[in-house]
Interface confidence: low
Amino acid sequence: MRTFNYWKKRNVRGPEPVVFFGNLKDSALRKKNMGVVMEELYNMFPEEKVIGIYRMTSPCLLVRDLDVIKHIMIKDFEVFSDRGVEFSKEGLGSNLFHADGETWRALGNRFTPIFTSGKLKNMFYLMHEGADNFIDHVSAECEKNQEFEVHSLLQTYTMSTIAACAFGISYDSIGDKVKALDIVDKIISEPSYAIELDMMYPGLLSKLNLSIFPTVVKNFFKSLVDNIVAQRNGKPSGRNDFMDLILELRQLGEVTSNKYGSSASSLEITDEVICAQAFVFYIAGYETSATTMAYMIYQLALNPDIQNKLIAEVDEVLKANDGKVTYDTVKEMKYLNKAFDETLRMYSIVEPLQRKATRDYKIPGTDVVIEKDTIVLISPRGIHYDPKYYDNPKQFNPDRFDAEEVGKRHPCAYLPFGLGQRNCIGMRFGRLQSLLCITKILSKFRIEPSKNTDRNLQVEPHRGLIGPKGGIRVNAIPRKLVS
């Protein structure tokens, strides 16, 4: 058993670890979400640039200083291109999010074009259809009961949107497959202790060829991809969606990560690699946006003045556009976009951010040298609630994202999508599908707290991402038609 004197020997301050768990006892026992634990650790040493912590028995560095973060995420990205998630690359392990630096380069170059403005505009009509179906469903339900648990409800919208935009699946045509949601949700909601095992014995999962993904999830994505490949006769269909791109890669047979295209650094595009990408797009496309929208609706219920301003903006923009929500009108709504940004400040979904040093590295502005393979962690939540950067951080205030205010802040004081080259590839997609749906909701409903609205909302400890414990209950009140 490694001893907990690694950081002491290097004169790096940090909280006292406990045997076996290091500093992660509460998250390992699923008493608290990992993101919340990291925020607490961040807050323990307000004067330190970096904090030495232990994830189970592995020493890691939690970085607090924004200039150091800028080096790690942007300036010295080459050293930190790897996320340091070590498990079997069979199954779903070779996905774009978890892939090592080289695999990520090979894949990332290929997938970035999916999210150009032109492609997003093409996807918009599919999102629109999903949003209309969603609103029809809410309207119908409203006649029976005005209280909704919006988190699970919004998952049905984002699930159908990602299915349509990425895979060309219209879920209404699949009937009982509509709720593929459940399968995918297993990943996020059912705790796997494989992650803790990796923290204790880095590389063990890889060595034993163990995955962190349940077999049922792997099988689901295999059959999803098999069906779509069969439907399209193994060739791109001309839809130019995510699946077409994957089929192009499948025809190529491999992709290379370096600019010379040497086969030594090429990634063979097997059906397993394809399944892995399908998986990560699904997860990233539905859960993050659904949770963000749910939290945004929660804050609008608790802040009627802000909601009124948003409704006024939505009404005004829709009136000027014959009642139509378009790709451009969504971008036009300044206050709506600011409210979305403020939601992500308060509820950054992916916590913590993680990188691995690919060589020894001296932390700028300190005497600390971290060894090759050390995991570096960043707590967006810690930063986002730090009064040093945000006054009255627990208050929902979209005005923090006025251009002038943003300009005054350090560029690394806001990290909901990560930062640098390995930031969130789908952030524009997520914003678009979220703001479209919120616009539709506000054009038809006023959101109010219900008798079951939890005003002291906790973070679900069992989920890998940030999410509301027990869901979010609010009332949706149909707005009376005003002539």
Epitope: H137, S152, L153, T156, D176, K177, V178, K179, D182, I183
Partner: nanobody
């Protein structure tokens, strides 16, 4: 395990109505959605409607939209299928099924109830 018991089937004239019920018992907390399927003689079993327990999200197959209404009573752990304007083509064994969280296919089935529509 989830046990399902259908009732309400029978013989009816074309244009008539029926209300099928499906009572669930056992580990119903694991059940995420309930569906009604039907199987006509010599044909494959098809999903006609389903409903999620949590948020009441509903699906209808195109062939029954407008004539079939699925609803639920969470307190009674019961799902209903209201069938209006019955046609001879609706003659089939109607099965109630339940789907657990974490699965895409329906994994618990009732015994089925016969619906016969005569012209």
């Amino acid at each position: 395990q989830v046990q399902l018991q259908e009732s309400g089937g029978g013989s009816v004239q074309a244009g008539g109505s029926l209300r099928l019920s499906c009572a669930a018992s056992g580990r119903t907390s694991r059940s995420y959605a309930m569906g009604w399927f039907r199987q006509a003689p010599g044909k494959e079993r098809e999903l006609v409607a389903d409903i999620a327990w949590s948020d009441g999200r509903i699906y209808y197959s195109d062939s029954v939209k407008g004539r079939f209404t699925i609803s639920r009573d969470n307190a009674k752990n019961t799902v209903y299928l209201e069938i209006d304007s019955l046609k001879p083509g609706d003659t089939a064994v109607y099965y109630c099924a339940s789907r657990a969280r974490g699965t895409v296919s329906y994994n618990y089935w009732g015994q089925g109830t016969q619906v016969t529509v005569s012209s």
